[in-house]
């Protein structure tokens, strides 16, 4: 199915316009901004979501890098170019003809250049580290309970098979969720770790992308897990290409 048939809405993406104009009068939903048809039984790609979000205020972040090749989303929001499948195009440019290359999660991985800049391929982000700090609780969470709950959440809410949750680390108050997904591992129909991480990030910030669902209520053995800060690191299959000037 593609959308909730009864009231013609998209359960996985509230930034859509839906109408019963699909084959046989079926409900069909299109993403705002791009007008592309989306499959409402799974997560919408991050590229289409960013495109739809462009009316929202800019929200730039600066994150600490855990290794020399880890990327963070310093550039904040931009209006991306998406391919016909909804993936980020390897080269992104703004209205002033400034261009740069991005990875599969849309994060810049080169210095900015002009229209002559070439981005030969869309480089896959195969490892995402989600770094969370939770609010103080009476005691530490049980690590295995926390691991189980986060894996359940990614499977049931974000439709990500637990085999792509490589590990859940915990040293109170820091939780790290490692998502890993090589190109060879990702089968047709598998949710992309970049999309799952983006939905999770928005949920954690209280900006849920889901239609008509309550916000994320994370509990471990009944104890609320309230996140007070989130950092996300992205590692690509091919290391990024930045000039030395940026690294100093």
């Amino acid at each position: 199915h593609t959308a909730a048939q009864d009231n013609c809405t998209c359960p996985t993406n509230k930034m859509t316009v839906c109408s019963p104009d699909g084959p046989g009068g079926r409900c069909q939903c299109r993403a705002l901004g791009s007008g592309m048809a989306v499959d409402c039984s799974t997560l919408t790609s991050k590229c289409l979501l960013l495109k739809a979000r462009m009316s929202a205020p800019k929200n730039a972040r600066t994150l600490v890098r855990p290794s020399e090749h880890a990327l963070v989303d310093n550039d904040g929001l931009y209006d991306p170019d998406c391919d016909p499948e909804g993936r980020f195009k390897a080269r992104q440019c703004n209205q002033t003809s400034v261009c740069w290359c991005v990875n599969s999660v849309g994060v810049r991985r080169t210095d900015k250049g002009d229209l002559s800049l070439r981005c030969d391929e869309l480089v896959r982000t195969h490892h995402i580290l989600i770094d969370l700090r939770h609010r103080p609780t009476a005691g530490a969470f049980n690590h295995s309970d926390l691991d189980a709950e986060l894996r359940r959440l990614f499977r049931e809410r974000y439709r990500l098979h637990p085999k792509f949750v490589a590990a859940v680390h915990y040293e109170q108050p820091t939780i790290q969720i490692e998502l890993r997904q090589n190109t060879s591992q990702k089968a047709a129909g598998d949710v992309d770790i970049g999309d799952a991480a983006y939905y999770f990030e928005r949920d954690i910030k209280g900006e849920s992308l889901f239609q008509g669902r309550g916000g994320l209520d994370l509990r471990v053995r009944g104890e609320p897990l309230q996140v007070e800060r989130t950092l996300i690191y992205y590692l690509d299959e091919i290391p990024p290409k930045f000039s030395m000037k940026r690294l100093t």
């Epitope: 199915h1 359940r152 049931e156 637990p162 792509f164």
Partner: antibody, heavy 119, light 111 residues
């Protein structure tokens, strides 16, 4: 405590359809997907598919595609498995089983429903 | 589909003695150190029950005489001292890839 209670035994004729129910209790229904597994007399276990209780859509074993439909009713915390175009080989005990927390293991099982297909 | 091959088919045991069941998988079910392999026991006339998940984790409420080991394609279920209540059919199962598949089963019976 977590419980999965299935509907009673059924006798069907070849070509007919059967709909088996599985009522969940003791936990938040939409937090865990439900699988269906069948077991022919004296045979092993065979996975038929899984339904997301959160979204309502299902993923089926290719072997049963086109014949099996899994649905759910959140108002009654019940999952249904309908198998159509029944043949004698479909005579089996049908189990619903809940996903466990982290690794897609099946941590709770229903008591099973015997479906007999006979002319 | 991933094929699960269990051995032996039948295992006559003496109470108090150890028992071991093997499960070989046609392709690896390991993902970043997590093995999507589980063991179930189906006692006579009952539904299957989960014993071990993720190859070696004991399910809550299961006696610690049960243990699981292995990774990749070769897995083992061990019972340190078999008790009369352990009789039934033991199944291994992979949940790495759809369709999830089970081994053919090992029937454990008291000698």
């Amino acid at each position: 405590q977590v419980q999965l209670v299935q509907s009673g035994a059924e006798v069907k004729k070849p070509g007919a359809s059967v709909k088996v129910s599985c009522k969940a209790s003791g936990y938040t229904f939409t937090d865990y997907s439900i699988n269906w597994v069948r077991q022919a007399p004296g045979q092993g276990l065979e996975w038929m598919g899984v339904i997301s209780t959160y979204y309502g859509d299902a993923s089926y074993n290719q072997k049963f595609k086109g014949r099996v439909t899994m649905t759910r009713d959140t108002s009654t915390s019940t999952v249904y498995m309908e198998l159509s175009s029944l043949r004698s080989e479909d005579t089996a005990v049908y189990y619903c089983a809940r996903y466990g927390d982290g690794y897609n293991q099946f941590d709770y099982w229903g008591q099973g429903t015997l479906v007999t297909v006979s002319s | 589909d991933i094929v699960m091959t269990q051995s032996p088919l039948s295992l006559p045991v003496t109470p108090g003695e150890p028992a071991s069941i093997s499960c070989r998988v046609s392709e690896s079910v390991d993902s970043y150190g997590n093995n999507f392999m589980h063991w179930y026991l189906q006692k006579p006339g009952q539904s299957p029950q989960l014993l071990i998940y993720r190859a070696s984790n004991l399910e809550s409420g299961v006696p610690d005489r049960f243990s699981g080991s292995g990774s990749g394609t070769d897995f083992t279920l061990k019972i340190s001292r078999v008790e009369a209540e352990d009789v039934g059919v033991y199944y291994c199962q992979q949940s790495y890839e759809d369709p999830y598949t089970f081994g053919g089963g090992t029937k454990v019976e008291i000698k």
